[in-house]
Amino acid sequence: ALLPAREATQFLRPRQRRAFQVFEEAKQGHLERECVEELCSREEAREVFENDPETDYFYPRYLDCINKYGSPYTKNSGFATCVQNLPDQCTPNPCDRKGTQACQDLMGNFFCLCKAGWGGRLCDKDVNECSQENGGCLQICHNKPGSFHCSCHSGFELSSDGRTCQDIDECADSEACGEARCKNLPGSYSCLCDEGFAYSSQEKACRDVDECLQGRCEQVCVNSPGSYTCHCDGRGGLKLSQDMDTCEDILPCVPFSVAKSVKSLYLGRMFSGTPVIRLRFKRLQPTRLVAEFDFRTFDPEGILLFAGGHQDSTWIVLALRAGRLELQLRYNGVGRVTSSGPVINHGMWQTISVEELARNLVIKVNRDAVMKIAVAGDLFQPERGLYHLNLTVGGIPFHEKDLVQPINPRLDGCMRSWNWLNGEDTTIQETVKVNTRMQCFSVTERGSFYPGSGFAFYSLDYMRTPLDVGTESTWEVEVVAHIRPAADTGVLFALWAPDLRAVPLSVALVDYHSTKKLKKQLVVLAVEHTALALMEIKVCDGQEHVVTVSLRDGEATLEVDGTRGQSEVSAAQLQERLAVLERHLRSPVLTFAGGLPDVPVTSAPVTAFYRGCMTLEVNRRLLDLDEAAYKHSDITAHSCPPVEPAAA
């Protein structure tokens, strides 16, 4: 058997003396004779021990025995014992009792042979077995007096060899994590929850993390089980960034030719139907009306100009109805309406003139007379020595119901090269030059332009009582939107419930999938804040796209360019959402085009204003923005700038 080095040396040192053991016994008899039975001198003691160190150790102590017990001749038994013990330096035992295996007497010295785990001259020092190679333990070594033992970290148990450790599988206990998933780990285990949930050790269950408390969103945050959604102020022109937490500006992705012409006058600026220009002519000299201008429109109906006095006196109104010129006139309280000439709402420039002659009015289109009406009287009316004429453009100075035949006064049209009463008109030119809102787009096409800064709304009813059903109401919402977007985010169509300040229905462009948190260009169909269906769309290609939405009892579909969108809800959820929509439709709702009123950003997936061209058909009826209950003045009802040609 091999011994550790330390024990081996301890063992070998006394073994060197084992050969002299016979001599030791002889020495003891010699000592008895010389120094116990007789009184011996130092020299005699030297002869006994045959060396100086043992002699030097023995003799002073021998004299102490004499002093203590008297000389050998007194025959005191204590003396003999005293002297006999002097050469054995292990008596009394100087070694530590706990740590010593044996004491070895040496020449004037002794050696303590230590037990395993002890050291030091007297074997009173504990040996720290753990200081060398961790005592052979795999994990934890515990030193203790004269010994040591191995142990394991939490989650491990000591193997039968007393040194190595093996992992405890805590997940074997089904109660370890309660409702959560248990994952065994080396020396431990983890209770796992789905993303957005955190483990509660108290409840042994997964609990939703309210990410909103962590301030993840730049603007508005909505927590949901296992997730959260950030919302940005769409009406303020913001949308979610790529990181789905911060906000960024909604920027045009398709450039439209929105350049304006400073020498043009836009007639559709005032949604109220009030004139865009009011001129007051006054003369000492009797004068006749002469008005000439170039005109362009796609709008089928509206007022070009009014000339005359107050509503009960003498006046004329030049208007458009069904795309043709119409002249309404009232002379001395008698009203007439005349309509004639070609369809002129083709969007091309043409010159129109109105001339008051001695006894008739002549209307010309491109220098050709299209109307010649006999009149009895003058448009300039005398008052306190002066002749007066009010001329308004793009509207009338009184309510349209007071016309000979009511007409929608709003006219999305453009005038240029105007000339009133053969005079140069610097006033209007100067005003228009500094006010871009009074100017027209240089080039326009058919459609309606939403500039991304406002909406229009209508009061439409979606409940219908079919004749064959009696009193049972059914409902339907069918929307066809022809769109040419300029930006990737915005509300196309929406219903708003003013009483509840809710958005029962919305169709919008959005550039991310909210649940998958993925940037993607989509059309979203939603009831309140819940998306029912989504469909991909190439929104920034400058092309026209057709978005079709159909909702009725039990079904909801979304199509983009003839391709049906993906449902985002289960059949049960769909029914529940449609029931919510129907409840809203039974109360007053307003139909919004191009945006939403000031609603919380969480009311609908998108709250931003739409930017681009769009025409809307609702329940098989084309919506005319001139017929809206309200329209933002920057929305052009019947014209849209084209997409800017790509730079060569």
Epitope: K282, P286, G385, N422
Partner: antibody, heavy 116, light 107 residues
């Protein structure tokens, strides 16, 4: 561009007559009446009346009835003011101004000095 | 005949001062008031026409207000070129009548 150009200054003796002209250009002369305004030295403006450029019919304010005559020559698009039996108090600058109910376009003025 | 009472007949002002000239009419003339500026040896220049309308090319520091019988011409911050004579003119009825004028001088 509308222009009204008046004849030069006149120095006349009391009792004499003077005829000053106002030549119009840059617009249809007969579409607008022509007004006359007087401004005595250091004084304010006074409207004298106007002439209908279609009919040639003049209209005078009370103060200027009698010795003052407005006339026209449409062929040369010119309006005239004649003052007869001049008096020292007729010394003034006389302006023509186009009728627009108010006066936007004015002649530069003609100074008539009546002094013995 | 509508008579116009213009005040003050003269005033002294420094560059940058706000200047107000008033014109009161003897009859209600609605908003048929006009304001003119005249510099020595020159024809009057129309600043404000009926309906308190600022004429093209006239600086925005000039403004007209009022209707009925009380009218005001205001120069919000007088510039060196504004020192001149100012007249009001009513065009509500014939005869047309001017105010007596206000001389705005440098203080």
């Amino acid at each position: 561009q509308v222009h009204l150009v008046q004849s030069g200054s006149e120095l006349k003796k009391p009792g004499a007559s003077v005829k000053i002209s106002c030549k119009a250009s840059g617009y249809t002369f007969t579409n607008y009446g022509m007004n006359w305004v007087r401004q005595a030295p250091g004084q304010g403006l006074e409207w004298m009346g106007w002439i209908n450029t279609n009919t040639g019919e003049p209209t005078y304010t009370e103060e200027f009835k009698g010795r003052f005559v407005f006339s026209l020559d449409t062929s040369v698009t010119t309006s005239y003011l004649q003052i007869s039996t001049l008096k020292a108090e007729d010394t003034a600058v006389y302006f023509c101004a186009r009728d627009e109910g108010w006066f936007v376009y004015w002649g530069q003025g003609t100074l008539v000095t009546v002094s013995s | 005949e509508t008579t116009l009472t213009q005040s003050p007949s003269s005033l002294s002002a420094s560059t940058g001062d706000r200047v107000t000239i008033t014109c009161i009419t003897s009859t209600d003339i609605d908003d048929d008031m006009n304001w003119y500026q005249q510099k020595p040896g020159k024809a009057p220049k129309l600043l404000i026409s009926e309906g308190n309308t600022l004429r093209p090319g006239v600086p925005s520091r000039f403004s007209g207000s009022g209707s009925g019988t009380d009218f005001t011409l205001t120069i919000s911050s007088t510039q060196p070129e504004d020192f001149a004579d100012y007249y009001c003119l009513q065009t509500d009825s014939v005869p047309l009548t001017f105010g007596q004028g206000t001389k705005v001088e440098i203080k």
